[in-house]
Structures are given as structure tokens and as C-alpha cells.
Amino acid sequence: EVEKTACPSGKKAREIDESLIFYKKWELEACVDAALLATQMDRVNAIPFTYEQLDVLKHKLDELYPQGYPESVIQHLGYLFLKMSPEDIRKWNVTSLETLKALLEVNKGHEMSPQVATLIDRFVKGRGQLDKDTLDTLTAFYPGYLCSLSPEELSSVPPSSIWAVRPQDLDTCDPRQLDVLYPKARLAFQNMNGSEYFVKIQSFLGGAPTEDLKALSQQNVSMDLATFMKLRTDAVLPLTVAEVQKLLGPHVEGLKAEERHRPVRDWILRQRQDDLDTLGLGLQGGIPNGYLVLDLSMQEALS
């Protein structure tokens, strides 16, 4: 806390400029008017204040706006934003996408900080849903943003926003998140033709059910192995050898390299060895000829 002292003669700040970097902390406290600072916040970003001096400037704004800063000030905080705590940010009401962009720019190139996470949370809650423009902005700054949301939070993403999602935005999503996103993507891209549809839906297929994979196998999509390996195991298991062959097209040869990994390993265990042999890949571990396969889960459901 800076002591209250009178401003020395001739040192009262008339504007926010570089002369202030030569002021000691107590002089900044005494000689800079908080209202002046608030109206000229945009100048701070160009001036190299020390961390200690920034603490004083923040303190002055906190005194002027104890209930939280107005958006006109927030939009021009610049690198003073880095001094804000999540508690400070929770007092804000940020409604403008321009304000959000300005503050995300300050943190650009860094991991998502607790301050940024709080800011985004406040902004999205204020909007009521994650609209396309917001999602566009957030994923541009933080490609992993979408995958940091819980399935519950993802449920507020409208299908129209899915158009903003790039494949790399989904890299760290787990199956639970893709389960929520896939139906939205399916809805968003439903009017596209076969090959274009597959290009768009491909990144979301980790949430696809068996029936959709079966449908895709009829469309000559030539799914690559990387995509296949991300499919839900429970969705892959019911697929026949013929369906997998059609689904992968020329990429089917890649199954051999992945035969010890899920979902390929578990899928092999469910296929007749005879059928696997038709692929000519030397895949082993299928059900030997002459054995009867009982689906116990189906039997339990019937009894």
C-alpha cells in the first residue's frame, strides 16, 4: 500500500505520458489523477512502466471503480490486464467482442492464464451461449479452448458455431467431449455432399455411433488410420470386415501396424478369422472357424 503524500510542486500529471516512468511510486500515487488515468488508459500500453509502477496505476483504478471497471476502461487496459486477478475480473461486465479480443491480444503467445479463463467465462456467460464469432475468436487465440470445456458447457454451443472449428481445435478433446460435439457437427454439415461432408465431419468422428460409421462405409470415403484410431471402440466393434475395408479403402493396409492397439485389437478379436484372412494382411487373433459366437450382453438384455 502506498502512503498518501502531497504531490510535489510542478509534478501534477496533466496527461499520461512517458515522463511518468521517472516518478517514484509515491509520486505516481500522489500526482496522477485516477479519472485522468481512466480516460487515457490507451496510452499506458505504449509506455514501459515497471511492475511496481503498474501496481500503483492499478490501485488508483481500483479506488476509482471499487465495484469493477467500466467496459470503456477494460477495453484499453492493455498490459495492465496482466496485473488483474480473477477476483478483479469477476466484477466486470464484458459484452463487446472487441474488448475480449483486445485483452486476449495482451496474453497472446502464452498459456491460458486463470485471468483469461475467468474473462472468457464472464464473457460467454454474459452472452448466454458460445456463438460463432466468439468461438472464432477464442479458437484463434487458443486452439485447445474447445477441449477445455466440460461436456455440459459444450452443450451450449449452437450447431452453427461448429463451422468455426478447425481440426487442430479438437486435438485434445476426449471422447466425452466429442460425443457432445459430433451430433452438432452432423447437423451443421448435413446439407453438404458426400466428399465435402466427410472432410468437415472427419475431426468429429470420435463421437460417431456405429450406424453412422456403417453409412460412411458406403460412401467411398477412404478414412485414414489416424482418424480410425480415434473412433469409439464401442462404435467400431460391430463393424464387419467388409465395412471396415470399405471405410478405410486403400488405407486398410495400415491395420496391420495397429493390430495391437485399440480399437483395432478389440475389433480383430470380434471378427471371424476367415473374414480377416480375406484382407490378406496377416491379421491374427480372430475367432477360429467353427466356433459359435454368443453375444452375452444381448442375451442378458433379452432375459
Epitope: E18, I21, A46, Y79
Partner: nanobody, 112 residues
Framework: QVQLVESGGGLVQPGGSLRLSCVVS????????MAWFRQAPGKEREAVAS????????IYADFVKGRFTISRDNSKNTLYLQMNSLRPEDTAVYYC?????WGQGTQVTVSS
């Protein structure tokens, strides 16, 4: 992002001179104020001299007036600090700054 790299520090005798350089890369500087700061052990960082890249305005701290000169070379994107008549109390790590961006610092030691 803006990168700042200082050089030119070293050991010099009282009354001697040094010229510090700061090469700036990554972004144009028109909108920034650039400055030299220093920090002696156990003391707060303090501004030594500043230059407004767009207006050319120069400001010096009272304790270096008449001894230090700040200048720039636009074509080389470089900031300089010419330090003459150095004193033992000028011993510190000297930092170059542009807006929110800071260099790593260069050590200046004035001792006989």
C-alpha cells in the same frame, strides 16, 4: 512479439565511458516509448532515459543529466545509451524496454 537484446555492458573505471546497445525485432516501434532502466542490487528498478519513437522527445533522470545520452538508429532498429563520466553508483543491471516488452539486461560495473 517484440524481442529486445541488450549488449555493451562491462567493467569500467570511474570517469570512464560505455555505450550500450539494444536491438529490437519483431514489430515496428512507431507507437512505442523506449527507455533505459537500471536496477542496482537490493534497489527498485529506475528509469534512466526515454525516447518517444514517434515524436523524438527525450527525457533524462536527474541523476544522469549531462552524462548520459539516449539515441536511436531507425534503420538498424537499435536504441543506444552513451554513458560518460561513470561513477561507482552507476553500477547496476541496465535494461532496455519498449512498451510492455523488456530485455534481459546487461551488467555495468564501475570500479577501480
Amino acid at each position: 512479439q517484440v524481442q529486445l537484446v541488450e549488449s555493451g555492458g562491462g567493467l569500467v573505471q570511474p570517469g570512464g565511458s560505455l555505450r550500450l546497445s539494444c536491438v529490437v525485432s519483431g514489430r515496428t516501434l512507431e507507437s512505442y516509448v523506449m527507455a533505459w532502466f537500471r536496477q542496482a542490487p537490493g534497489k527498485e528498478r529506475e528509469a534512466v532515459a526515454s525516447i518517444n519513437w514517434s515524436s523524438g522527445r527525450l527525457i533524462y533522470a536527474d541523476f544522469v543529466k549531462g552524462r548520459f545520452t539516449i539515441s536511436r538508429d531507425n534503420s538498424k532498429n537499435t536504441l543506444y545509451l552513451q554513458m560518460n563520466s561513470l561513477r561507482p553508483e552507476d553500477t547496476a543491471v541496465y535494461y532496455c524496454a519498449a512498451g510492455r516488452y523488456w530485455g534481459q539486461g546487461t551488467q555495468v560495473t564501475v570500479s577501480s
